[in-house]
């Protein structure tokens, strides 16, 4: 039997220059398409090798993207929220929550969708 | 680590019609960037269409033939091949990635997708 999984949550202000191919990262989540269960909210599902974000180190898989410049990502559509990334500018600013699996007891499987991976 | 498993492929005549599939695990398919490429014997690895949480994307050569389509509850993409020529012969391959680029986005580019199948073979001839 596996033992209980808890999570540690953090928040991190992430500033990114935009690269030459862009920022690097791909997303899931929105209203019209929810990653987490009961939560529209948007989540990092790929970090790109060598993009900005590889590069800088902090952005990970999981991370859920709570605002871009400044802007709330809350109760947006999918593709509202990409537009926003791709039109964000040169620098771009990201409060993104980390959510660190801690383990107690044996270890779990975390499976694909859960937002820690 | 997302499993993509293509079927449909097989000998067809020219003017003929096939509909290939592509079945991938995962709870998340919704979710997936996923698109056909296709190689012939001695040839690059060619893009032939992409399917995006927002649209279709084709290659010039195949564009008003073929048509890319999903079944989300399936977990499975399509590729409705009609008006088939000699020269779209080709293993058929698919790929896919979790989520959507906030970059701009290129269909034709295989480093846009992270996981890959092994292919049908799609063979046109009379």
């Known amino acids: 039997m596996n033992g209980r999984v808890d999570y540690l949550v953090t928040e991190e202000e992430i500033n990114l220059t935009r690269g030459p191919s862009g920022l690097g990262f791909n997303i899931v989540g929105g209203t019209d398409q929810q990653y987490v269960s009961n939560d529209s909210g948007i989540y990092v599902s790929r970090i790109k090798e060598n993009g900005a974000a590889a590069l800088d180190g902090r952005l990970q898989e999981g991370d859920k993207i709570l605002s871009v410049n400044g802007q709330d990502l809350k109760n947006l559509l999918h593709q509202d929220a990409v537009d926003l990334f791709r039109n964000a500018g040169y620098a771009v600013s990201l409060r993104v929550q980390h959510r660190l699996q801690v383990q107690n007891g044996p270890i779990g499987h975390r499976g694909e969708g859960d937002p820690s991976g | 680590e997302v499993q993509l498993v293509e079927s449909g492929g097989g000998l067809v005549q020219p003017g003929g019609s096939l509909r290939l599939s592509c079945t991938a695990s995962?709870?998340?398919?919704?979710?997936?960037?996923m698109a056909w490429f296709r190689q012939a014997p001695g040839k690059e690895r060619e893009f032939v269409a992409a399917?995006?949480?927002?649209?279709?994307y084709y290659a010039d050569s195949v564009k008003g033939r073929f048509t890319i389509s999903r079944d989300n509850a399936k977990n499975t993409m399509y590729l409705q091949m009609n008006s088939l020529k000699p020269e779209d012969t080709a293993v058929y391959i698919c790929?896919?990635?979790?989520?959507?680029?906030?970059?701009?986005?290129?269909?034709?580019?295989?480093?846009?997708?992270?996981?890959w199948g092994q292919g049908t073979q799609v063979t046109v001839s009379s």
């Open positions: 399917i995006t949480w927002s649209g279709t």
């Open positions: 995962g709870r998340t398919f919704s979710t997936y960037t």
């Open positions: 790929a896919a990635v979790i989520g959507s680029t906030v970059d701009s986005y290129s269909p034709s580019d295989p480093l846009e997708y992270d996981y």
